[in-house]
Interface confidence: medium
């Protein structure tokens, strides 16, 4: 990359991080620049649970942090584009009566919402602890999509690997049956939502990420867009979490780990969400971007604008 | 996936009544089941609301006493009504809320002597 | 309890035409109202919520908007199958430490 350019990028990044401080609005770009101009962080800061190599099931080339907020915490690689909280429209609602015409959704990768519905079905079998076989998986996936089906089976294992801790293991070398393996080691999350069943705790974390990567607040459209990554969508229930709407703006602040609230001025009216007293008392930024490094393949210092800002909380709360 | 309401009928003035919310097709743990009445050529009244991820109840202030609201099985919530009076007679509505909503065909209850 | 005031009660309008009905809270109540039709012998049947979301397969001539305490629900370009009665509803909201449920009065649209 030309040296102008990135001394421009880096301009742009100080910029865009005095914002974040006012507007908290932004989806954070983690630049090539940034990665490679990164200050070296040590994990001993934080007591050493970061991992730098990457986690298992990412892509590892190349391996630099997502393009935002919403695809760092999904753990996903590639770019995505914004879709706002109407991103899908589901089948009608059993009990409507309507003789209109339905509205048309806006246009979505049909890979991308293939393997959100799998892993919606993969969630599902886990929960009811139950195998799962390739035949089972190519029903959800459809015959349309049948020669995609490795692509569309590697993004959901992705999915189910870096944001709920769940491995697919194939239970022999040439076998069609799949059994899951938990890899997370929940010591580190275990105050948060202990109460909870696993699927939905697990969606805490990477929550808590995507309101940290957007200035330490996130609009419903971009908590919306990382949800969409996982198969959740706003009016439409899922299979595990049941009903996404109550889960994030009801349950997860009634618990107070999140804050929902008008954005101040706004006209028509946005919200946003914000990290709840809970999560300032039971986790930290720098747990959170581990977290985020470790479902990323990387260490915090992908992040080091976030990374600055949680060494400095950590200072404050002498850590 | 559906909601059916049972147990409407005819009932006498300061008798008691219990309907049930049968859900089929899933589970009511992670959302709020609401009842709904709505007397003949009327609008909707809300009764009250339980949120099945916690068992938290909720109830308009008119509700409060006479009528108890809970969740009975994984799969169905009552409400409970007490001291009814002619102008309770309604159809009375189950709903799953909010953003995914889903309602019974509802249960006529009449209160007459 | 929070109380919803819907007007007008009733409105009559032509095949094609708009109809515009209002809803006021009588405290704010952020984005967490929702717009429902309800035909004769029919559960109520979600169009809008979170203020100005359209339910699924809701056609975009439906438009939802407001917030706050003033709320608006706008359908053109109507069709003899929009004539039906139309409730707006105040549903739980998360910024709010008290639980609301609470439905306006209703509208009857007549289409002509």
């Known amino acids: 990359m030309p040296r102008g350019q990135k001394s421009k990028l880096r301009a742009r990044e100080k910029r865009r991080k005095a914002r974040d401080e006012t507007r908290g609005l932004n989806v954070p770009q983690v630049t090539e620049a940034e990665e490679e101009e990164a200050p070296c962080c040590s994990s001993s800061v934080s007591g050493g649970a970061a991992s730098s190599s990457p986690a298992a099931g990412i892509p590892q080339e190349p391996q630099r942090a997502p393009t935002t907020a919403a695809a760092a915490a999904a753990g996903v690689s590639s770019t995505k584009s914004k879709k706002g909280a109407k991103s899908h429209q589901g089948e009608k609602n059993a009990s409507s009566s309507q003789a209109s015409t339905s509205t048309k959704s806006p246009s979505e990768d049909p890979l991308t919402r293939k393997s959100g519905s799998l892993v919606q079905f993969l969630l599902y079998k886990y929960k009811i602890k139950k195998s799962v076989t390739k035949g089972e998986m190519l029903k959800i996936v459809g015959k349309r999509f049948r020669e995609h089906f490795p692509e569309i089976l590697k993004k959901a294992s992705e999915g189910l690997s870096v944001v709920f801790g769940l491995e697919l293991n194939k239970v022999n070398p040439n076998g069609h049956t799949y059994t899951f393996i938990d890899k997370v080691d929940l010591t580190d999350e275990e105050s948060l939502l202990s109460s909870w069943d696993f699927p939905r705790r697990k969606l805490l974390m990477p929550l808590l990420g995507v309101i940290f990567l957007n200035g330490n607040s996130a609009t419903e459209e971009e908590i919306w867009e990382f949800l969409n990554m996982l198969g959740v969508y706003d009016g439409e229930e899922h299979s595990v979490f049941g009903e996404p709407w109550k889960l994030i703006t009801k349950d997860l602040v009634q618990e107070k780990y999140l804050e929902y609230k008008q954005v101040p001025s706004s006209d028509p009216p946005r919200f946003q969400f914000l990290w709840g007293p809970r999560a300032y008392a039971e986790t930290s930024k720098m747990k959170v971007l581990e977290f985020l490094a470790k479902v990323n393949g990387t260490t915090p210092c992908a992040f080091p604008t976030h990374y600055e800002e949680a060494l400095k909380d950590e200072e404050k709360a002498g850590v | 996936q559906s909601l059916e309401e049972s147990g409407g009928g005819l009932v006498q003035p300061e008798g008691s009544l219990t309907l049930t919310c049968t859900a089929s097709g899933f589970t009511l743990n992670n959302y709020y089941i609401c009842w709904v009445r709505q007397a003949p050529g009327k609008g909707l009244e809300w009764i009250a609301c339980?949120?099945?991820?916690?068992?938290?109840t909720y109830y308009a202030n008119w509700a409060k006493g006479r009528f108890t609201i809970s969740k009975t099985s994984s799969t169905t919530v009552t409400l409970q009504m007490t001291s009814l009076t002619a102008a309770d007679t309604a159809t009375y509505f189950c709903?799953?809320?909010?953003?995914?909503?889903?309602w019974g065909p509802g249960t006529l209850v009449t209160v007459s002597s | 309890d929070i109380v919803m005031t819907q007007t007008p009660a009733s409105v009559e309008a032509a095949v094609g035409g708009t109809v515009t009905i209002k809803c006021q809270a009588s405290?704010?109540?952020?984005?967490?109202l929702a717009w429902y039709q309800q035909k004769p012998g029919q559960p109520p049947s979600l169009l809008i919520y979170r203020a100005s979301t359209l339910a699924s397969g809701i056609p975009s001539r439906v438009k939802g908007s407001g917030s706050g305490t003033q709320f608006t629900l706008t359908i053109s370009d109507l069709e003899c199958a929009d004539a039906a009665t139309y409730y707006c509803q105040s549903y739980d909201d998360s910024s709010s430490s008290s639980f609301f449920y609470a439905f306006g009065g209703g509208t009857e649209v007549v289409v002509k």
């Open positions: 709903a799953r809320s909010l953003a995914t909503p889903l």
């Open positions: 405290e704010s109540i952020g984005n967490a």
């Open positions: 339980i949120d099945n991820a916690n068992g938290r």
